[in-house]
């Protein structure tokens, strides 16, 4: 019987099994009973990343600098270009089609995780004993100054946004 199913990396056409084109190549013509599938390599700036029967290769992704994008990994005939964002920016989606400026952590919040090209800054509230008095994409919460270790006393309590104010100890007269 003519085949109704084909082996892996084959496809059924005209009651016969033809080889799929390998990654990096596109289909030119289906196989015949005498010759195998004709495939051609993808051109410059094109790719196909699977065994396929595509008649056109896909265009490599363009990393548009106007959108804050730059090339992280150049595409090949078998892989797409991977874009990432310029310093200080991160991708808005997994596909990284555009970039936004890294978020800064407001006073009272510190950086838990610094942003990368694909993820935004993660902020956390400064817990008791820590503060942040700046808006920053890099600064963590800082511990309050320890007045005791300086032989001083707390004159003004710290908050999540301000450090403690230390002063001299009252001397007995």
């Amino acid at each position: 019987e003519p085949p109704t199913a084909c082996r892996e990396k084959q496809y059924l056409i005209n009651s016969q099994c033809c080889s799929l084109c390998q990654p990096g190549q596109k289909l030119v013509s289906d196989c015949t009973e005498f010759t195998e599938t004709e495939c051609l390599p993808c051109g410059e700036s094109e790719f196909l990343d699977t065994w396929n029967r595509e008649t056109h290769c896909h265009q490599h992704k363009y990393c548009d600098p106007n959108l804050g994008l730059r090339v992280q990994q150049k595409g090949t005939s078998e892989t797409d270009t991977i874009c990432t964002c310029e310093e200080g920016w991160h991708c808005t989606s997994e596909a990284c089609e555009s970039c936004v400026l890294h978020r800064s952590c407001s006073p009272g919040f510190g950086v838990k995780q610094i942003a990368t090209g694909v993820s935004d800054t993660i902020c956390e509230p400064c817990p008791v004993g820590f503060f942040s008095n700046v808006s920053s994409a890099f600064e963590k919460c800082h511990p309050w100054t320890s007045c005791e270790t300086k032989d001083l006393v707390v004159q003004q309590a710290g908050t999540n946004k301000t450090d403690v104010v230390c002063g001299p100890q009252d001397r007995l007269r």
């Epitope: 019987e1 080889s19 005498f34 195998e36």
Partner: antibody
Amino acid sequence: QVQLVESGGGLVQPGRSLRISCAGSGFTFGDSAMHWVRQAPGKGLEWVSGISRNSDTIVYADSVKGRFTISRDNAKNSLYLQMNSLRAEDTALYYCARRSGDHHAMDVWGPGTTVTVSS
Amino acid sequence: ETTLTQSPATLSLSPGERATLSCRASQSVNTYLAWYQQKPGQAPRLLMYDSSSRATGIPDRFSGSGSGTDFTLTISRLEPEDFAVYYCQQYSTVPLTFGGGTKLEIK
């Protein structure tokens, strides 16, 4: 078992005709494309012609185009090669071969039949 | 027409040795290449297809590689029954073509 057997070879004068046959057994003959391949004495293999399962596609080597005709009768499990206007250079051992069912190489060959073109 | 050139024309080796046979195509045939073995007085026998796939019943000392224009048939350890003529054949385009053959003889 799967088998191909050629017949009909012999001595023939230049310019004359000859028809050789190939009988298949042990497989569904009509499910396979078939080929003729020849081998001149002391020489290598030369593909001559091929025919699809239902005879709708036929291909020939340039050296025999217009002189040789391939055909098949699936009901009789038979393949044929009609050779006209024979030349001395057609002298060879003629093999019939089956195209494999799951790839394009020739996986079963007959023992061959000898065609000698000489005056 | 795709021309296949086999080298060397003759290869003289001893049983137990490794044999490397080459087949070069005049244009790319992808991986659509077969290898056949022929012994005197016998019909050719299919060894490899699609460049690197062994045909049914072929021992694993035979292996094939290559794609595009350069192909190799390797016999890892020669057995006495391996001494024969080897042909490559492409099925990428019509006309189908065979290489001129490599004769593997006992040294």
